[in-house]
């Protein structure tokens, strides 16, 4: 058994608040423009920091109509704040050779929100493996 | 060390409110986030929310919405949870708990709320 | 909203003994699970997170096991000072605690 580090893991600090993040995203749904948006799935291992970047650049926003405008662009720059570095060495990372942005697939924001998660998941699965 | 000092007890009439601080020490403030937790005489464990140190952002459980308000003042490393429209069932024990990441890994030394006329 | 129910309510062991404890979740909630110990008049501590894994300082014979919506908390043998109740708790969806689970000397 690991212990928890005794020095702050920024890294796991900061998935772990933007699962939270998605989740209140997930709750105001239907206050999301309906435009489709880039959704990265089956992403493989040495790339979850590339497609999380592409979930980032994604123009997922309020719509015109939809209440709670200020409170969803809050949530949205806190998506958007850049993640911490790795604690260990990323040379594998730099090496792959990870899909653009363009070549996933296009989903409503429900979908995409499900996406990120299951992404956000797999990172923190991934960062305690 | 990580310390939460928390303020103390507060006895309370019915539609009044109430703001418990938990002051935090031993690690840098804005690096954690904050949840608040309470537990009724006798009863279980019930998340309130929780919020950010460095933001002002804040989550609410459904239930205390409209209630609660979640706030810190990063000069002093306190957070602050208000409970308005006090009613009797929510007598109890509230905890400030530090979130840590993947769980309240510290826990202040609760406040208890008591609500009576 | 996610529930947590956790089995036996209370239970009534000796010094020793091997003590089980579980926890299910009303929808699949991953790895996504702490414990925690609460003794009378205390603030709860923290035993283990993530499922398995043993916070700073906790001792080795407090053990996590499960995923998905079926989850176990074992003392592989009872301390005198293990008599408190245990709370589980899903972070999967915002947090939800069960009902705790009392240990009380037989």
């Known amino acids: 058994h690991k212990s928890s580090p005794q020095r702050p893991d920024h890294l796991l600090i900061r998935l772990r608040h933007l699962m939270d993040i998605v989740e209140q995203l997930k709750i105001y749904e239907n206050d999301l423009d309906p435009e489709l948006l880039t959704a990265p799935q089956d992403v493989k291992g040495q790339c979850e920091h590339e497609a999380f970047a592409c979930f980032q650049k994604a123009k997922l926003k309020p719509s015109n109509t939809g209440n709670n405008k200020t409170f969803i662009n809050d949530l949205l720059a806190q998506l958007r704040r850049r993640l911490p570095a790795k604690r260990t060495g990323n040379k594998q990372r730099h090496m792959a050779k990870c899909p653009s942005c363009d070549l996933y697939e296009k989903k409503t924001p429900k979908e995409f929100l499900e996406r990120l998660k299951w992404l956000l998941q797999k990172m923190i699965h991934q960062h305690l493996s | 060390q990580v310390q939460l000092v928390q303020s103390g007890a507060e006895v309370k009439k019915p539609g009044a409110s109430v703001k418990v601080s938990c002051k935090a020490s031993?690690?840098?403030?804005?690096?954690?986030?904050m949840h608040w937790v309470r537990q009724a005489p006798g009863q279980g464990l019930e998340w309130m929310g929780l919020?950010?140190?460095?933001?002002?952002?804040?989550i609410y459980n459904q239930k205390f919405k409209g209630r609660v308000t979640m706030t810190r003042d990063t000069s002093t490393s306190t957070v602050y949870m208000e409970l308005s429209s006090l009613r009797s069932e929510d007598t109890a024990v509230y905890y400030c708990?530090?979130?840590?990441?993947?769980?309240?890994?510290?826990w202040g030394q609760g406040t208890l709320v008591t609500v009576s006329s | 909203d996610i529930q947590m129910t956790q089995s036996p309510s209370s239970l009534s062991a000796s010094v020793g003994d091997r003590v089980t404890i579980t926890c299910r979740a009303s929808?699949?909630?991953?790895?996504?699970l702490n414990w925690y110990q609460q003794k009378p008049g205390k603030a709860p501590k923290l035993l283990i997170y993530?499922?398995?894994r043993l916070h700073s300082g906790v001792p080795s014979r407090f053990s996590g096991s499960g995923s998905g919506t079926d989850f176990t908390l074992t003392i592989s043998s009872l301390q005198p000072e293990d008599f408190a109740t245990y709370y589980c708790?899903?972070?999967?969806?915002?947090?939800?605690f069960g009902g705790g689970t009392k240990v009380e000397i037989k």
């Open positions: 708990a530090r979130y840590g990441p993947l769980a309240m890994d510290y």
């Open positions: 919020i950010d140190t460095s933001d002002v952002y804040t």
């Open positions: 993530y499922t398995s």
């Open positions: 929808q699949d909630i991953s790895n996504y």
């Open positions: 708790q899903q972070f999967h969806t915002l947090r939800t």
């Open positions: 031993g690690y840098t403030f804005t690096d954690y986030w």
